[in-house]
């Protein structure tokens, strides 16, 4: 039978037939920065080119005792997971290995930097197709390592890294904390976070998604036909590097932002038991397990969005938190969240020619998070319209008045420490869907966008009785771009998007006042792009044989339980 | 994923512009910073990545590295330039005593300096 990890990342449509793409990833080159590898292993022979790059910390002179097989173990296994003939994800991908980790699996930030520089120079000397760089390593937070990753990503390289095995916040480690890198946590066959006593997968807002990372069968450096199981976030990252290679091979023009959005979109949602994560990290950690797309056809028309959480603001009264989208993404809405409920809302503001989402802490608050909804919207022209506090009893309102602009998100920000319980109307006037409504003492910010074929609608779900969580989801074919709460009273902790669902959290029901005061409405703005759908249909008509489904259907490959059939 | 995050240590060493009478003193008001790994056992003191400002050319990187060596030698310190970066980030990797950090932070074009640290297979 197919190994559990390959089954898990295979779309359901293909599972019954055990399809494995025969040459997935053939247009892509994957660089592996790791230990030395056994390049003559049958799994990877002819697929991995060992470069002459080596930069590792000195090993003890007495290390001649250490067998080469152990020195090669980590890297050989990962190369097999990415592109192995039998147990690999992207069986057609070619790889290049750089040795930056010694026999103990230890390296240095400087050695890794020089390795990344080597890749950039190789790319400049001999430009090839899409490049994926796999960094199955982690150290403490490093400004310089993150900066180097950022530069390489901006040069068009896709970087995939391990979240780390420290059972800790991934933001405390590098390159896991680099925003441009795709950071991968590890899950097991039960879709639960990988744990081993005091250690386990890292988590938190710096993780992009999870992937299989426990009991992963792959090439063993014991012998050229040997296999072994290994576990860790390196194995998880190798799965995502393989999936990325498959996607890029099917669509070589994908940008990093597009690839990341697709990885998120095609992931299995809400399968991880969040109880394993520390309570304060649950909301920040993506509940996503990576999977291959069923096909690339039909993906192009989607309006892809993801949620980006800021770092915590800290508890000082004037503290703020900022969430940013990637350079190629559009900020379509901005919300905020505070566990204590003490916050002063959020606003979208320009910073360095780009919109960012800023959340404001309040006096006595333990701090806030800013939550950006970042979307791929080609040819978009977005602006923020602001209405100052209205003072009138009807509350503050703002709408998109420019021709062809649609409302994608609403934010509200207030200077007063406590908005109190003055309740603005929950229902907005009929025939005016394009407006944001907020508390009369708050300034309201509307995100208004013009993009070809973009249409949006507002969806609300109100609960009259107090409840800790109110949700509203966009229906099939629509994408959540905005998520906010009505009213903006102090018992609302905040609002945030989880996949296509808008979640509004309120204070524990026992601490809220009367029923009327406890009423909360979750407001979702759902959008779709007719333009992208049309473009995708045209593309489908003009191209054939380039999608992942064609690769999938080209050949059926059996998983061989016993690997000594090579003899 | 934020850039300035975690219990990461940043030591800001103030510039004393009069020292050494540098011909190319850093622009007014900018302070180069020193960074090191917050996880003590992973620190590798004695090796430092000197990161220069974004638009610094390779020739300027090499010149800055030589200047550091010369100024260190005048103070009786031996330094070794292990690598000059270009292509991704401008800068250089230097093996030197931590006593020279204050001096290095005052060099022209320096954006920040980071002490080397360990990374591990995951």
């Amino acid at each position: 039978s197919i190994p559990w990890n390959l089954e898990r990342i295979t779309p359901p449509r293909y599972r019954a037939d055990e399809y494995q793409p025969p040459d997935g990833g053939s247009l892509v080159e994957v660089y592996l920065l790791d230990t030395s590898i056994q390049s003559d292993h049958r799994e990877i022979e002819g697929r991995v080119m060992v470069t002459d790059f080596e930069n590792v910390p000195e090993e003890d002179g007495t290390r001649f005792h250490r067998q080469a097989s152990k020195c090669d173990s980590h890297g050989t296994h990962l190369a097999g997971v990415v592109s192995g003939r039998d147990a690999g994800v992207a069986k057609g991908a070619s790889m290049r290995s750089l040795r930056v980790l010694n026999c103990q699996g230890k390296g240095t930030v400087s050695g890794t930097l020089i390795g990344l520089e080597f890749i950039r120079k190789s790319q400049l000397v001999q430009p090839v197709g899409p490049l994926v760089v796999l960094l199955p390593l982690a150290g403490g937070y490093s400004r310089v390592l993150n900066a180097a990753c950022q530069r390489l990503a901006r040069a068009g390289v896709v970087l995939v890294t391990a979240a780390g095995n420290f059972r800790d916040d991934a933001c405390l480690y590098s390159p896991a904390s680099a925003p441009e890198v795709i950071t991968v946590g590890a899950t097991n066959a039960q879709d639960q976070p990988v744990t081993l006593g005091t250690l386990g997968t890292n988590f938190g807002r710096c993780v992009d998604l999870f992937a299989p990372g426990e009991d992963i069968i792959g090439a063993s450096s014991d012998c050229s036909t040997c296999f072994v199981s290994q576990s860790g976030t390196s194995q998880a990252a190798a799965h995502v590097a393989g999936i990325a290679a498959m996607m890029l091979s099917a669509e070589p023009e994908l940008t990093l932002a597009e690839l990341r959005q697709r990885l998120i979109h095609f992931s299995a949602k809400d399968v991880i038991n969040e109880a394993w994560f520390p309570e304060d990290q649950r909301v920040l950690t993506p509940n996503l397990v990576a999977a291959l797309p069923p096909s690339t056809h039909g993906a192009g028309w989607q309006l892809f969005c993801r949620t980006v959480w800021s770092a915590h603001s800290g508890p000082t009264r004037m503290a703020t938190a900022v969430a940013r989208c990637a350079p190629d993404e559009e900020l379509l809405s901005c919300s905020s969240f505070s566990r204590s409920g003490k916050r002063r809302g959020e606003r979208m503001e320009a910073q360095g020619g780009k919109l960012v989402c800023r959340a404001h802490n309040a006096f006595g608050g333990e701090g806030v998070y800013a939550i950006a909804r970042c979307c791929l919207l080609p040819q978009a022209n977005c602006s923020v319209h602001t209405a100052p506090p209205a003072e009138a009893s009807m509350g503050t309102r703002v709408h998109c008045h420019q021709q062809g602009h649609v409302l994608t998100g609403c934010s509200s920000h207030w200077e007063v420490e406590d908005l109190g319980t003055h309740k603005p109307p929950v229902l907005r006037p009929r025939g005016q869907p394009n407006q944001c409504v907020g508390h009369r003492e708050a300034s309201i910010h509307a995100s208004c966008c013009h993009a070809p074929g973009l249409e949006c609608k507002v969806k609300e779900h109100g609960i009259p009785a107090p409840q800790e969580q109110v949700t509203v989801a966009c229906e099939e074919g629509w994408t959540l771009t905005g998520c906010s709460a009505l009213p903006g009273t102090s018992h609302v902790l905040g609002a945030y998007a989880v996949d296509n669902t808008c979640v509004v959290r309120s204070r524990d029901v026992s601490t809220t006042g009367s029923t009327s005061e406890g009423a909360v409405t979750a407001v979702a703005i759902c959008c779709r792009s007719r333009h992208l759908a049309q473009a995708s249909q045209e593309l489908q008509g003009s191209t054939s044989g380039s999608g992942l489904n064609d690769i999938f259907e080209a050949q059926k490959i059996e998983w061989h339980e016993h690997h000594h059939h090579h003899h | 994923q934020e850039d300035e995050d975690g219990d990461y240590e940043e030591l800001v060493l103030a510039l004393r512009s009069e020292e050494d009478g540098l011909a190319e003193a850093p622009e007014h008001g900018t302070t180069a910073t020193f960074h090191r790994c917050a996880k003590d056992p992973w620190r590798l003191p004695g090796t430092y990545v000197v990161v220069l400002k974004e638009e610094t050319h390779l020739s300027q990187s090499e010149r800055t590295a030589r200047r550091l060596q010369a100024q260190a030698a005048r103070r009786g310190y031996l330094t070794k330039i292990l690598h000059v970066f270009h292509g991704l980030l401008p800068g250089f990797l230097v093996k030197m005593s931590g006593d020279l950090l204050e001096l290095a932070l005052k060099l022209p074009h320096v954006d920040y300096i980071e002490e080397d640290s360990s990374v591990f297979a995951q």
Epitope: P3, D60, T62, R63, H65, R66, Q67, K70, S73, H74, Q104, G105, K106, N165, L196, L199, D215, I217, S220, D222, C223, T225, C226, F227, V228, S229, Q230, S231, G232, S234, E561, H562, H563, H564 | F120, A121, Q122
Partner: antibody, heavy 121, light 107 residues
Framework: QVQLVQSGAEVKKPGASVKVSCKAS????????IHWVRQAPGQGLEWMGY????????KFNQKFKDRVTMTRDTSISTAYMELSRLRSDDTAVYYC??????????????WGQGTTVTVSS | DIVMTQSPSSLSASVGDRVTITCKAS??????VDWYQQKPGKSPKLLIY???NRYTGVPSRFSGSGSGTDFTLTISSLQPEDFATYFC?????????FGGGTKVEIK
């Protein structure tokens, strides 16, 4: 659950051979190396070697190299350790253990219950 | 072969005592040391992997430290079920080698 079940106690004469079996269950047998460790009465633990069940690859402690054979039968998820030319100082409890690799850390996470081998004339 | 020298070979302690067992390697084994507990007539059980990481289900009173050639297993507050023999083992190079063991007895 994951377990290793070993064959029963053996009494052998000097010069004879003994073959101890170790049946794995609860996991993919071909995914983990099986190591053999022995413990003489009142003594410490001594590593003998291992087999990678995905192939026939073995690695031995030089001390036992000429006398030990390690094999496996994947159809019944069983590993075997045969020690020949037995001497009285081979009297010991023989354990099989599964080696696990997590990150770059290696350890024996599952042990068999042990097989007592007594060598006596 | 790398020799792992464990000390003491035995010790007597009372419930609630803090117990420290040391292991010295004849050469640098980095952090590549595991610790096992064995009770009479039973198989060894993994306590600590890679010098300092507590294995699943192992009580927090057990901790490990060290790197290079010197390693320590500490039981912060000895419990009745902790009376057993403890072994260190290096996996840095073949052949794997174990320490001679430390028997922890009731005082």
């Amino acid at each position: 659950q994951v377990q290793l079940v070993q064959s029963g106690a053996e009494v052998k004469k000097p010069g004879a051979s003994v073959k101890v079996s170790c049946k794995a269950s609860g996991y993919t047998f071909t995914g983990y190396t099986i190591h053999w460790v022995r413990q003489a009465p009142g003594q410490g633990l001594e590593w003998m070697g291992y087999i990678n069940p995905s192939s026939t690859y073995t690695k031995f402690n030089q001390k036992f190299k000429d006398r030990v054979t390690m094999t496996r039968d994947t159809s019944i998820s069983t590993a075997y350790m045969e020690l020949s030319r037995l001497r009285s100082d081979d009297t010991a409890v023989y354990y099989c253990a599964r080696e696990r690799i997590y990150s770059n850390y290696w350890f024996f996470d599952v042990w068999g219950q042990g097989t007592t081998v007594t060598v006596s004339s | 072969d790398i020799v792992m020298t464990q000390s003491p070979s035995s010790l007597s302690a009372s419930v609630g005592d803090r117990v420290t067992i040391t292991c010295k390697a004849s050469q640098n084994v980095y952090w590549e040391v595991d610790w096992y507990q064995q009770k009479p007539g039973k198989s060894p059980k993994l306590l600590i992997y890679s010098a300092s990481n507590r294995y699943t289900g192992v009580p927090s009173r057990f901790s490990g430290s060290g790197s290079g050639t010197d390693f320590t297993l500490t039981i912060s507050s000895l419990q009745p079920e902790d009376f057993a023999t403890y072994f260190c083992q290096q996996y840095s190079s073949y052949p794997y080698t174990f320490g001679g063991g430390t028997k922890v007895e009731i005082k």
